[in-house]
């Protein structure tokens, strides 16, 4: 469970791909599309709102008790807007929500270098977010070694 | 209730070698970042190892890069600092500490009780 | 690498004083910043986290701000279990400690 209903800080940040491919967000349609792109020298990359949670790891699974926290994001490009795990369709979807946000748009976040994250669907353990032909896609994780797998790897900047 | 306990502190002649351990207990030691990070007499905190939770990447400051190795078992929930080619100036307590959060690198959030290693002919 | 530099490095306080401790970080670490307590003898203990979150079980009294490379820790009430050294510490980019802040008995 979320431990607190506003998150603990926010973060607006670019994010790109470990390969620093840019993640862009194009109103299409009035739905939004998710792509992952080269972006041209000078040209603005998309910021992203990042907010963090405190969530309970369920102590029967971790033996932590109290003391199995992990950090929960939620990824919004625009306002209103956050990042969504299909899992029906392993892919990942920008979708208009209001508050309290369903599990869908929480994300476990993960760093398994120091400079950078991957971001685990909650409603899916062992699912993450990750780059599948120019776009995102949900991806099964099937051991920690292959948390380090590059196209689950995203780096965060402020730039 | 989350325990680390070091061992391995001691004297040891410079240029020479001495490997510290951590016992962690009450916690899911693989899901976590682990630490070392060492204080010299009277002076101040110095973050000098840390190891990601499946032991994929290990890091360093310049100041023992290359003369320290964090690593860390697993299955006997056990972190380690080989400490090689030892100067004076690693005389320090060598606490052992673990992330705040399951899977992710930021804070400190439970700290052992430290070793003392001092290094002198 | 990231410097992280604490002022002042020691100072002198009475029972029920406000107290206010500051560390610049030599680049932006967002709110990438904690703040420890450490009494004699003892290791260090989590205070505050990601800037402004107080760790289970710290008093109230304790506080932190900032954002970016400006950070401050308040204790607004010193009492006599307050005396100790306060580091800050950054984890937005490696890991990196200030240099402390010994709060004395005036």
């Known amino acids: 469970s979320i431990t607190g209903i506003s998150p603990i800080t926010e973060y607006l940040a670019s994010l790109s791909t470990y390969n620093d491919q840019s993640i862009t967000f194009a109103l299409e349609d009035e739905s939004y599309e998710i792509y992952v792109e080269d972006l041209k020298k000078d040209e603005k990359k998309d910021k992203v709102l990042l907010s963090y949670y405190e969530s309970q790891h369920p102590s029967n699974e971790s033996g932590d008790g109290v003391d199995g926290k992990m950090l929960m994001v939620t990824l919004s490009p625009t306002k209103d807007f956050w990042l969504h795990a299909n899992n029906k369709e392993h892919s990942v979807e920008l979708h208009k929500s209001e508050k309290p946000l369903p599990d869908q748009a929480f994300f476990v976040l993960h760093n398994m270098h120091s400079n950078s994250v991957s971001f685990e669907s909650k409603t899916d353990p062992g699912v993450f977010i990750g780059v599948k032909d120019n776009h995102l896609a949900l991806i099964k994780v099937d051991s920690s070694e292959n948390l380090s797998t590059e196209n689950i790897l995203f780096k965060l900047s402020e730039t | 209730e989350v325990q680390l306990v070091e061992s391995g502190g001691g004297l040891v002649q410079p240029g020479g070698s001495l490997r510290l351990s951590c016992a962690a207990s009450?916690?899911?030691?693989?899901?976590?970042?682990m630490y070392w990070v060492r204080q010299a007499p009277g002076k101040g905190l110095e973050w000098v190892a840390a190891?990601?939770?499946?032991?994929?990447?290990?890091y360093y400051p310049e100041s023992v890069k290359g003369r320290f190795t964090i690593s860390r078992d697993n299955a006997k929930n056990s972190l380690y600092l080989q400490m090689n080619s030892l100067r004076a100036e690693d005389t320090a307590v060598y606490y052992c500490?673990?992330?705040?959060?399951?899977?992710?690198?930021?804070?400190?959030?439970?700290w052992g009780q430290g070793t003392l290693v001092t290094v002198s002919s | 690498d990231i410097q992280m530099t604490q002022s002042p490095s020691s100072l002198s306080a009475s029972v029920g004083d406000r107290v206010t401790i500051t560390c610049k970080a030599s680049?932006?670490?967002?709110?990438?910043l904690d703040w420890y307590q450490q009494k004699p003898g003892k290791a260090p203990k989590l205070l505050i986290y990601?800037?402004?979150n107080l760790q289970t079980g710290v008093p109230s009294r304790f506080s932190g701000s900032g954002s970016g490379t400006d950070f401050t820790l308040t204790i607004s009430s010193l009492q006599p279990e307050d005396f100790a050294t306060y580091y800050c510490?950054?984890?937005?980019?490696?890991?990196?400690f200030g240099g402390g802040t010994k709060v004395e008995i005036k």
């Open positions: 190891i990601t939770p499946n032991a994929g990447e290990d």
């Open positions: 510490f950054q984890y937005n980019q490696g890991w990196t």
């Open positions: 500490a673990r992330g705040h959060y399951y899977y992710t690198s930021y804070s400190l959030g439970y």
């Open positions: 990601f800037t402004n």
């Open positions: 009450g916690f899911t030691f693989s899901s976590y970042w």
């Open positions: 680049q932006n670490i967002n709110k990438h």
